[in-house]
C-alpha cells in the first residue's frame, strides 16, 4: 500500500485505490496543484440557493462544493465570522437565522421566533453581533451571534427594509428598502441618527461595502443596473448597465461579484469600470446571496472589540469610533451606562 | 416587442419524427440570459413542459420524454428546434414556445401549432 | 417529480365577485418558486405572477399570489369579464418543473 510510506506524500488524506494512489482534503480544506497539498483557501466565495449554501475556491480550480448542512430550506441571506470560520444564513421558510462552522458541524438555530421575511443579514465582528433585516415584520434588530440579547432598533417607518451591510469600525448600518419609495438608508448602528442616503434608486439589493476604497455597491432590480456611491451616497456611478437581471452582488480587492438571474450565473468585472468580466460559475438557477469568505473583509478595530466595551449584554458601535452598551427587550440601562437590568 | 411562433407539419404518422421551429423576434439568446422553452397541450387537457434550452446552450428535458426529445438553437436565425422521435396517438397536441426570461419562467408565448398524429 | 393540485376544478362565478384559486404541492416547494397562468380557450397562455407574489408586466392589480411551502392562491379581488379562463400553477423549485391540472372560472 503506498498510503504506508510517508502517507504517499500526501499533506492530509492519502486514498489507495486499484486506479492507484490519490490525496484527498477534509473538508473545509482544498487540494492545490501539485495534487499532494491541502490548504484552507483563502478566499472563496459562499452563495446561496434554495436548500443549498455552496462555495467556490478563487484560488484553486475546485468549485461549486456543498457544505454539509442538514435542514436547510430556503437559504436566503448570508454571512460568516472569520475568527470562528462560522457561516450564517436566514431561512425564509422556516423562519430562522442559523449558523454552522465551515465544515458543516455544530448547526444550530440562532434566532427562531419572531421572525417572517428575514431577508438581509449581516454579521457584526467586532461586536460579535447579528444585524437582520425582515421585510414581513418591517423591523431592523440585533442580537449576540449566538442569538441572546435581542432588541429591535429601527421599527418607525420602515417599508420593506431588505439588504443590510455593517461598518463596525465606522459605527454605520446601512440597509436599502423595497416599499412603496426604494431606498437606501444609514444609521448608526444602535439605531439612532437615521437618514436618507439614495433616495431615487429602485429595489435595491446586494447592499456591500468596499471598506478600503469607503465605496458602497448594489444591484438595482428596477433598472438592472449595478450602481456605486461614496459613503454618503454621492459620486454615483454605473458600473454595469447592460446586465439582465443582476441580483445578488459582493466585493473582493479589485473586483465585484455577482449573480445574475437570467444569466443563470455567477460573475466578477473591475469594481470601477465593470471591465474585464468573467463568468465565475454557470447553470445556477436562483442565487440568492453571495459573499466572499476573507479576512481582509473582516478587520478594523472599535471600542466594542475590547471586552465587550465592558456591556453587559449589548455593545453597539456608534460613529465616530464610539459605541452604547444596549439591553434586551424589555431591559432597561442603568445609569452607570454599562448594565442592564431585568424588568 | 417579444414575439415567437411555431412552425412545423399539422399531421404526423405514427413513428415519424417530429420537427418544430420556434422563431422569435424581440430577444436574443446570444449573451444576454434568457431561454426558450417547449411545452405541449393535448386537447382539453393540461399544459406539459417538454423542454428549454438557454443562452449558454444549458438544456433541460422532461424525465419522461427526455430518450425522445432533442433541442437546440441557431442563434443567428433567432430560431429554436425541437425534435420529438417516435411520435405516437397520444402525442397529438397544440405545441407552444415561449421566452425563459426568468430560470423556468415564462413570460412570452407563441400562438402554438397543433400537431395531429394519425396513420 | 412535484404533482400540484389545483382546486376547486370550476368555479362559477359572476362579474364583480372574488375569486380563490388554490394550489398545493405534493412537497415543500420553498415561498418564490411558483408561477401563475392564465389560458382562454384557443389562446395561449399569459404569464400573471411569478416568484409566488410578483406581479407580470402589464397583469392588472386585481391579480394577487401568495403562499409559501405546499399552499398558494392566487386572488382575483373583483371579476372583470375577461378575467373568465382556465388557470394553471406551475412549480419550478425542483426539476422537472410542472404543473396543475387548471382550475376554470366559468360565469355564474
Known amino acids: 500500500n503506498p498510503c504506508a510510506e510517508e502517507n504517499g506524500g500526501c499533506s492530509h488524506l492519502c486514498l489507495y485505490r486499484p486506479q492507484g494512489l490519490r490525496c484527498a482534503c477534509p473538508i473545509g480544506f482544498e487540494l492545490i496543484s501539485d495534487m499532494k497539498t491541502c490548504i484552507v483557501p483563502e478566499a472563496f466565495l459562499l452563495f446561496s440557493r434554495r436548500a443549498d449554501i455552496r462555495r467556490i475556491s478563487l484560488e484553486t480550480n475546485n468549485n461549486n462544493v456543498a457544505i454539509p448542512l442538514t435542514g436547510v430550506k430556503e437559504a436566503s441571506a448570508l454571512d460568516f465570522d472569520v475568527t470562528d470560520n462560522r457561516i450564517y444564513w436566514t431561512d425564509i421558510s422556516l423562519k430562522t437565522i442559523s449558523r454552522a462552522f465551515m465544515n458543516g458541524s455544530a448547526l444550530e438555530h440562532v434566532v427562531e421566533f419572531g421572525l417572517d421575511y428575514p431577508e438581509g443579514m449581516a454579521v457584526d465582528w467586532l461586536g460579535k453581533n447579528l444585524y437582520w433585516a425582515d421585510t414581513g415584520t418591517n423591523r431592523i434588530e440585533v442580537s449576540k451571534l449566538d442569538g441572546q440579547h435581542r432588541q429591535v432598533l429601527v421599527w418607525k417607518d420602515l417599508d420593506s427594509p431588505r439588504a443590510l451591510a455593517l461598518d463596525p469600525a465606522e459605527g454605520f448600518m446601512y440597509w436599502t428598502e423595497w416599499g412603496g419609495k426604494p431606498k437606501i438608508d444609514r444609521a448608526a448602528m444602535d439605531g439612532s441618527e437615521r437618514t436618507t442616503l439614495v433616495p431615487n434608486v429602485g429595489r435595491a439589493n446586494g447592499l456591500t461595502i468596499d471598506y478600503a476604497k469607503r465605496r458602497l455597491y448594489w444591484t438595482d432590480l428596477d433598472t438592472n443596473l449595478i450602481e456605486s456611491s461614496n459613503m454618503l451616497g454621492l459620486n454615483r456611478e454605473v458600473i454595469a448597465d447592460d446586465l439582465p437581471h443582476p441580483f445578488g452582488l459582493t466585493q473582493y480587492q479589485d473586483y465585484i461579484y455577482w449573480t445574475d438571474w437570467s444569466r443563470r450565473s455567477i460573475e466578477r468585472a473591475n469594481k470601477t469600470s465593470g471591465q474585464n468580466r468573467t463568468i465565475i460559475q454557470g447553470h445556477l438557477d436562483y442565487v440568492m446571496d453571495i459573499l466572499v469568505f476573507h479576512s481582509s473583509r473582516q478587520s478594523g478595530w472599535n471600542e466594542c472589540a475590547s471586552s465587550n466595551g465592558h456591556c453587559s449584554h449589548l455593545c453597539l458601535a456608534v460613529p465616530v469610533g464610539g459605541f452604547v452598551c444596549g439591553c434586551p427587550a424589555h431591559y432597561s440601562l442603568n445609569a452607570d451606562n454599562r448594565t442592564c437590568s431585568a424588568p | 416587442q417579444v414575439q415567437l411562433k411555431e412552425s412545423g407539419p399539422a399531421l404526423v404518422k405514427p413513428t415519424q419524427t417530429l420537427t418544430l421551429t420556434c422563431t422569435f423576434s424581440g430577444f436574443s439568446l446570444s449573451n444576454r440570459g434568457g431561454g426558450v422553452g417547449w411545452f405541449r397541450q393535448p386537447p382539453g387537457k393540461a399544459l406539459e413542459w417538454l423542454a428549454w434550452?438557454?443562452?449558454?446552450?444549458?438544456?433541460s428535458y422532461s424525465t419522461s420524454l427526455k430518450t425522445r426529445l432533442t433541442i437546440s438553437k441557431d442563434t443567428s436565425k433567432n430560431q429554436v428546434v425541437l425534435t420529438m422521435t417516435n411520435m405516437d396517438p397520444v402525442d397529438t397536441a397544440t405545441y407552444y414556445c415561449a421566452r425563459m426570461h426568468l430560470p423556468l419562467v415564462f413570460d412570452s408565448w407563441g400562438q402554438g401549432t397543433l400537431v395531429t398524429v394519425s396513420s | 417529480d412535484i404533482v400540484l393540485t389545483q382546486s376547486p376544478a370550476t368555479l362559477s362565478l359572476s362579474p364583480g365577485e372574488r375569486a380563490t384559486l388554490s394550489c398545493r404541492a405534493s412537497?415543500?416547494?420553498?415561498?418564490?418558486?411558483l408561477a401563475w397562468y392564465q389560458q382562454k380557450p384557443g389562446q395561449a397562455p399569459r404569464l400573471l405572477i411569478y416568484g409566488a407574489s410578483n406581479r407580470a408586466t402589464g397583469v392588472p392589480a386585481r391579480f394577487s399570489g401568495s403562499g409559501s411551502g405546499t399552499d398558494f392562491t392566487l386572488t382575483i379581488s373583483s371579476l372583470e369579464p375577461e378575467d373568465f379562463a382556465t388557470y394553471y400553477c406551475q412549480q419550478y423549485y425542483d426539476y422537472p418543473q410542472t404543473f396543475g391540472q387548471g382550475t376554470k372560472v366559468e360565469i355564474k
Open positions: 434550452i438557454d443562452w449558454d446552450d444549458d438544456k
Open positions: 412537497q415543500f416547494i420553498g415561498s418564490r418558486y
